[in-house]
């Protein structure tokens, strides 16, 4: 039995898989900030987690996925307002009793030091200094990400 949030994540992922392959993104769109090989968009409005997930999808992006502690710190360094929280693409899977990224992978327990409970209807937010478990229905800001396509040098044969 999947929760409505899990269903929403799966539906969005499946619809994305059905779409035709788009050309790679070489530069970040206007208003998006580049962080290494990603483009990030920090929202200025607030939403519950599932609405934030859907908003990123409409922007042909996803809620932020964080690979490791280093990427977390670099992302947090972009947050100017110390009192603001942002949703990322991580929520509690009741069926698997574990934190699950929206791409289907599970959280490596060493990556994020989460403050708060791991329980049903809990989603993850980040601030400039911390990572919090929060009710998914809470209306806060969110971060969308787009992957940048690495530019490869073309090798031409000698003519």
């Amino acid at each position: 039995q999947k929760s409505s949030i899990e269903k929403c994540s799966v539906d969005i992922q499946q619809s994305r898989n059905k779409t035709t392959e788009r050309p790679g993104l070489l530069n970040c769109p206007i208003y998006w900030q580049q962080l290494r090989e990603k483009c990030l968009l920090f929202s200025h409005t607030v939403n519950p987690w599932n609405n934030s997930l859907a908003d990123c999808s409409t922007k042909e992006s996803s809620l932020l996925l964080i690979r490791d502690k280093d990427e977390l710190i670099h992302t947090q360094n972009l947050i100017r307002d110390k009192a603001i929280l942002f949703w990322i693409g991580l929520n509690f899977s009741l069926s698997e009793k574990n934190w699950k990224w929206i791409n289907g992978s599970f959280l490596n327990s060493n990556d994020l030091e989460i403050r708060g409970d791991a329980k049903e209807n809990s989603c993850i937010s980040i601030s400039q200094t911390s990572v919090y478990s929060e009710y998914c229905s809470t209306e806060i800001r969110w971060i969308c990400q787009k992957e940048l396509t690495p530019v490869r040098n073309k090798v031409y044969p000698d003519s």
């Epitope: 607030v46 307002d81 110390k82 009192a83 603001i84 929280l85 403050r115 601030s127 200094t129 911390s130 919090y132 929060e134 009710y135 809470t138 209306e139 806060i140 800001r141």
Partner: antibody, heavy 119, light 110 residues
Framework: QITLKESGPTLVKPTQTLTLTCTFS??????????VGWIRQPPEKALEWLAL???????LYSPSLKSRLTITKDTSKNQVVLTLTNMDPVDTATYYC???????????WGQGTMVTVSS | QSVLTQPPSVSGAPGQRVTISCTGS?????????VHWFQQLPGTAPKLLIY???YRPSGVPDRFSGSKSGTSASLAIAGLQAEDEADYYC??????????FGGGTKLTVL
């Protein structure tokens, strides 16, 4: 155990500068996410935020009092100092310092110090 | 004039449930900032009662609960007791990078 204590003059003359010190123990102002703020409360009135200083030396001030306020920290002494210039009788209040902790909340408060402005 | 608006007073009989509202705007509560609640007993310093909209610090009875929706927040006190008679303040942040308080609500236990 976390404690904060305010100290400074109890009586100040109009136009003088008030200097208050918050001495704290049980936490460090060099810890990421931590801050110390000042809040005042005139007799029988509401709480009014004055200033806030963070672990990284970021400072926030009340917009209405910004030109008169200065907040500084001495991490090694576990102290935060607030100065308020050009004191007026309307500045008569109990002045509190408080620690900014989890979720940006003032989780621990000092007992407060009453400051009277009178000639 | 406080940035956050609270009713000046509320009252209830012992055992009753009372709520205190805190209304802000799109630049503070509605901008996603947390709301915190403080209890100030007569002649004492304020004490943190609810942080992060709904969380209770250790030692605070579960009779106290907080919630937030849109540009408003509320504090509920169930099973009212005589010792709950106090002033209650809400607090949040503003996008102008300042801390904002409510004007306070005096709770009287009848």
């Amino acid at each position: 155990q976390i404690t904060l204590k305010e100290s400074g003059p109890t009586l100040v003359k109009p136009t003088q500068t008030l200097t208050l010190t918050c001495t704290f123990s049980g936490f460090s102002l060099s810890t990421s996410g931590v801050g110390v703020g000042w809040i005042r409360q005139p007799p029988e009135k509401a709480l009014e935020w004055l200033a806030l200083i963070y672990w990284d030396d970021d400072k926030l001030y009340s917009p209405s009092l910004k030109s008169r306020l200065t907040i500084t920290k001495d991490t090694s002494k576990n102290q935060v100092v607030l100065t308020l210039t050009n004191m007026d009788p309307v500045d008569t209040a109990t002045y509190y310092c408080a620690r900014l902790g989890m979720r940006h909340a003032f989780d621990i408060w000092g007992q407060g110090t009453m400051v009277t402005v009178s000639s | 004039q406080s940035v956050l608006t609270q009713p000046p007073s509320v009252s209830g009989a012992p055992g009753q449930r009372v709520t205190i509202s805190c209304t802000g705007s799109s630049s503070n509560i509605g901008a996603g900032y947390d709301v915190h609640w403080f209890q100030q007993l007569p002649g004492t310093a304020p004490k943190l009662l609810i942080y992060g909209n709904r969380y209770r610090p250790s030692g605070v009875p579960d009779r106290f609960s907080g919630s937030k929706s849109g540009t408003s927040a509320s504090l509920a006190i169930a099973g009212l007791q005589a010792e709950d008679e106090a002033d209650y303040y809400c607090q949040s942040y503003d996008s102008s990078l300042s801390v904002v308080f409510g004007g306070g609500t005096k709770l009287t236990v009848l």
